[in-house]
């Protein structure tokens, strides 16, 4: 921001009323008046260039310093070319001297040169030559000097002429302030510029109404430079929750809008499924039946638990069931849907039921499922199972009701045996198998069916109560199709998949385990 100038003395604006002291009186500096555009222009002039040993002084009135520490002196003046005078006027000068003196009281007409300290020799950038002077084209010069630090109650300025032809049209003395400033929603008071050029006065700002320093943020500070400029802003304020920045102020969020934290963002419109907020709201309450999870941002619409999964199917495959379902028709407005599967088994004879989580195996953990299918295995044959699939989302925990769908399935068969080739020779194959232990008590015998691959007209069957069998009298180097099926009191169980096993060729004979 531009520096603010506080004027202590303005000769040009005073209209010749200041009555400065001249010494010697009347013979050196004197006040003159000119009319320009029907307005009087006053100037102090001196032009005793033909006389040697000039020592003419012009002293201002006493100027009260007030709060100024460093003053700036702006001079507007003309200087005539010494060559305008005969022989270049050997005693003629083209400069004058600027002095100041501090004092705690006004000395009035008591003028003492010895009290004055020289500030500088003032030289013009442009001198006015004869032709310009006669054509009224005088060259106006502007020079600025500064003095500080000042410590007394007031001061005088003085101008010493030593034989120049000078007209002093303007003497303006001022000090600089960094102006009152609103920046970054912080108010910085008007501050007097310091007196020492390298120093920057640190000024603390105060947050405007309804603004705060953000957590972990720096308090607002600025630096007031000697020239009255604000520099190096540090920190800032932000509009608090429920308020937004409008120009340089924080304004309450309008009804129907909210802001949940101190930030630079504007107020946001209340999201879907919320009630209209009052002015200055930090959040918007949810409509009845809608909720906000603890981790949900205030900007997110309120949501509700999902409806039940859609189209739940249970497809039995021996002692396995594949459960499939489709997502709920109503997600509740959320994407964080998970599913939980629970299992209940019932004995057909007694109708007694109980949980079966401990005895069955799921293809993946049955709680927190994100996919819409799961396979349940290790089911016991001739049992009735009921599966429940519950859909949940981030707000399900906020209500007591549950959204679930159930499917029942009866297991009529054992699970297919898992078959392994244990060993082989040119004429035999040793085969073993296993089924889940809970089902083994139900099995009466195992039936092993085998045939040559490609021969669909004949097959052989072997029955055994054990978990292995050696198939003899086989042809060498021949592939056989082998299947194992459990037999229960109620009938056949599920058959294993058909395996292809090959006997050894005569060259590589010997009973080799695989």
């Amino acid at each position: 921001a531009q520096g603010k100038e506080v004027v202590l003395l303005d000769f040009a604006a005073a209209g010749g009323e200041l009555g400065w002291l001249t010494h010697p009186y009347g013979k050196g500096w004197d006040l003159m008046q000119n009319i320009m555009n029907d307005m009087p222009i006053y100037m102090y002039s001196v032009c005793n260039v033909m006389s040697g040993d000039q020592d003419n002084w012009l002293r201002t009135n006493w100027v009260y310093r007030g709060e100024a520490e460093r003053i700036f002196i702006e001079l507007k003046f003309t200087v005539r070319d010494c060559n305008s005078f005969p022989g270049g006027a050997s005693s003629c000068k083209e400069t004058f001297n600027l002095y100041y003196a501090e004092s705690d009281l006004d000395y009035g007409t008591n003028f003492q040169k010895r009290l004055f300290t020289k500030i500088d020799t003032i030289a013009p950038d442009e001198i006015t030559v004869s032709s310009d002077f006669e054509a009224r084209h005088v060259k106006l010069n502007v020079e600025e000097r500064s003095v500080g630090p000042l410590t007394r109650k007031g001061f005088y300025l003085a101008f010493q002429d030593i034989g120049a032809c000078v007209a002093l049209l303007s003497v303006r003395v001022y000090y600089k302030k960094c102006p009152e400033l609103l920046q970054g929603l912080a108010h910085f008071p008007e501050t007097i510029a310091g007196s020492d050029a390298p120093s920057l006065a640190t000024v603390a700002g105060t947050c405007v109404d309804h603004a705060v320093v953000p957590p972990g943020g720096e308090e607002p500070r600025m630096h007031c430079a000697v020239d009255g400029e604000w520099l190096v802003p540090i920190g800032q304020c932000l509009c608090q929750a429920g308020y937004e920045k409008v120009e340089d102020a924080c304004q309450a969020c309008s009804p129907g809008f909210f802001k949940f934290e101190a930030s630079e963002s504007p107020c946001l419109e209340c999201p879907e499924h919320t009630l209209p907020s009052p002015e200055g709201a930090t959040s918007c309450e949810c409509e009845e039946g809608f909720f906000r999870a603890p981790q949900d941002p205030a900007s997110m619409p309120c949501t509700r638990p999902p409806s039940a999964p859609h189209y739940l199917t249970a497809v039995g495959m021996g002692a396995k069931v594949e459960l499939r379902w489709t997502p709920p028709q109503d997600s509740g407005g959320r994407e964080d849907i998970v599913y939980s599967v629970t299992c209940e088994q019932c004995w057909p004879e007694s109708g007694e039921c109980g949980p079966c989580e401990a005895s069955v195996r799921y293809s993946e953990p049955p709680h927190g499922l994100t996919r819409t299918s799961v396979t349940v295995s290790d089911l016991e044959p001739h049992m009735n199972y009921t599966f429940t699939v519950e859909a949940r989302n981030g707000v399900s925990g906020l209500v007591t009701s549950r959204s679930f769908r159930t499917a029942s399935v009866s297991i009529n068969q054992t699970e297919p045996p898992k078959v392994r080739l244990e060993g082989r020779s040119t004429t035999s194959l040793s085969v073993s198998w296993s089924i889940p232990p809970p089902q083994q008590s139900r099995v009466w015998k195992y039936e092993v069916t085998y045939r040559k691959k490609g021969d669909s007209n004949s097959y052989n069957v072997r029955r055994t109560e054990g978990f292995s069998v050696t198939l003899d009298d086989l042809a060498p180097d021949t592939t056989y199709l082998v299947q194992v099926q459990a037999l229960t009191q109620e009938g056949q169980g599920a058959g294993s998949k058909v395996h292809e096993f090959q006997t050894l060729s005569p060259e590589g004979s010997g009973n080799l385990a695989v």
Epitope: G26, K27, Y44, N48, M50, S84
Partner: antibody, heavy 120, light 109 residues
């Protein structure tokens, strides 16, 4: 209105004294330098003396220096010229005049003049 | 002797333009002021500074300066302009405070 009214002129013998007065009205007397200018019969204008607004500074033409004294009473808005050791060549119409700005003029307001005759 | 020199007399026909000059070293440094004096009356300020007229002075009166010379010009002189005219300037030599020219008698024929 702005005016200067003079009094005190007259006939005086050589070596004698006379005090001229100039009463100001219509302006802030204490803000202006005041001058005396004289005009010998049939001659031109001759500057005599000046006094600063507060009365702290005075100057005289060489021809009257040491014999004439300029003074003012700002409380009475009056300018004076005390003339001592008068000579025949001091015979003139004496005018008081106001310097419109600064010490040296221009002279924008003039009194009506008062005749001083020095003769035996 | 006066340090500002004027011609003792100048004449002009009514309606004509006349110029009265004033010579002196001080005029290099300071502007001249011009006064009109009619018989039996106090002088009256006509021109001061670069070319400034106090209110009430007709605009047929104008002033100019060049080097050591200052001029008063009456454009379209009138009978009532017949009077004595004096130039005046600050003294740049330091000998005097202010000096008058010897005066010029203007006759309007």
């Amino acid at each position: 209105q702005v005016q200067l009214v003079q009094s005190g002129g007259g006939l005086v013998q050589p070596g004698g004294s006379l005090r001229l007065s100039c009463a100001a009205s219509g302006f802030t007397f204490s803000s202006y330098a005041m001058h005396w200018v004289r005009q010998a019969p049939g001659k031109g204008l001759e500057w005599v003396s000046v006094i600063s607004p507060a009365g702290t500074n005075t100057y005289y033409a060489d021809s009257v220096k040491g014999r004439f004294t300029i003074s003012r009473d700002n409380s009475k808005n009056t300018l004076y010229l005390q003339m001592n050791s008068l000579r025949a060549e001091d015979t003139a119409v004496y005018y008081c005049a106001r310097a419109s700005v600064g010490a040296t003029g221009p002279f924008d307001i003039w009194g009506q003049g008062t005749l001083v005759t020095v003769s035996s | 002797s006066s340090e500002l020199t004027q011609p003792p007399s100048v004449s002009v026909a009514p309606g004509q333009t006349v110029t009265i000059t004033c010579q002196g070293d001080s005029l290099r440094s300071y502007y001249a002021s011009w006064y009109q004096q009619k018989p039996g009356t106090a002088p009256k300020l006509l021109i001061y500074g670069e070319n400034n007229r106090p209110s009430g002075v007709p605009d047929r009166f104008s002033g100019s300066s060049s080097g050591t010379s200052a001029s008063l010009t009456i454009t379209g002189a009138q009978a009532e302009d017949e009077a004595d005219y004096y130039c005046n300037s600050r003294d740049s030599s330091g000998t005097h405070l202010t000096v008058f020219g010897g005066g010029t008698k203007l006759t309007v024929l």
